[in-house]
């Protein structure tokens, strides 16, 4: 297993609709054809997997149908979008990249993107 540098923004504020997008960029040492991207969430010292996708270079990322993540790839960059976020989902979202094929296997883990999520203010009651 060889180490690889992964860069991602330090802080992102999700939209009022609970959507956060960020780029995860990796320094590929070789010509990988198969890449796996995993998003991990760290909050209060606990790490959980948010979503994961394996893709062939030049093709779209395919997450599971019920995944809250979508993404596109361009060269050594992956543009990740996480939706359905609420204030309680605020936390550090870490991008993990694995170059699966061809060998050698490379692994890179970013420092994480702190995603702040603000629940929208409830609309004031109105009389009809």
């Amino acid at each position: 297993c060889k180490a690889m540098h992964v860069a991602q923004p330090a802080v992102v504020l999700a939209s009022s609709r609970g959507i956060a997008s960020f780029v995860c960029e990796y320094a590929s040492p070789g010509k990988a054809t198969e890449v796996r991207v995993t998003v991990l969430r760290q909050a209060d010292s606990q790490v959980t997997e948010v979503c994961a996708a394996t893709y062939m270079m030049g093709n779209e990322l395919t997450f599971l149908d019920d995944s809250i993540c979508t993404g596109t790839s361009s060269g050594n960059q992956v543009n990740l979008t996480i939706q359905g976020l609420r204030a309680m989902d605020t936390g550090l979202y870490i991008c993990k990249v694995e170059l699966m094929y061809p060998p050698p296997y490379y692994l890179g883990i970013g420092n994480g993107t702190q995603i702040y999520v603000i629940d929208p203010e409830p609309c004031p009651d109105s009389d009809f």
């Epitope: 923004p9 330090a10 802080v11 992102v12 504020l13 999700a14 939209s15 009022s16 997008s21 960020f22 909050a43 209060d44 204030a87 605020t90 550090l92 994480g112 702190q114 702040y116 603000i118 629940d119």
Partner: antibody
Amino acid sequence: QVQLVQSGAEVKKPGASVKVSCKASGYTFTSYGISWVRQAPGQGLEWMGWISAYNGNTNYAQKLQGRVTMTTDTSTNTAYMELRSLRSDDTAVYYCARVGANWFDPWGQGTLVTVSS
Amino acid sequence: EIVLTQSPGTLSLSPGERATLSCRASQSVSSSYLAWYQQKPGQAPRLLIYGASSRATGIPDRFSGSGSGTDFTLTISRLEPEDFAVYYCQQYGSSPWTFGQGTKVEIK
């Protein structure tokens, strides 16, 4: 080193607007956020809101909603805070601060805004 | 809105003494999102502690933070002359982000 430098002091009349700038250096501007905090004379710190320089999304304190606008210019690594319909109780030192994963650091040197007729 | 209440309002101590500052939240705050700042007259605030207990870069080890839930503490083990200032706690786990009203540490 990481530094935030703010624009100079302003004197404004009630009802006017003020726009304070905060120029960042020493780090990747779009990787972080910028928060704005004010401090009235002899008082404590009041959080006004913040902007994510990465995507331009903003979160404002409710009491200032509708009067405040925070923006960034990523070509010059500068954040701006505009406050409209100024009142005498808006007289304060206005600070910008870099928002990290779980901290505000560093802070700008502060900009004194005086609202007086 | 989470209200942070700091106590005491003023702490009168001599250099070399231990200072214990309290910050109590009206609702539970994730310790990841609790910070302490120091402010001297005419200066901008300076980050001391983030994540409730992690010292910021360049902050001497006489400053320490602890606590969880609704009760947080900043301790200065031995006061130096330059430590006399106003200290603020802040939470940024729940919007709106809020500050405590401050504790002034003054020379006795």
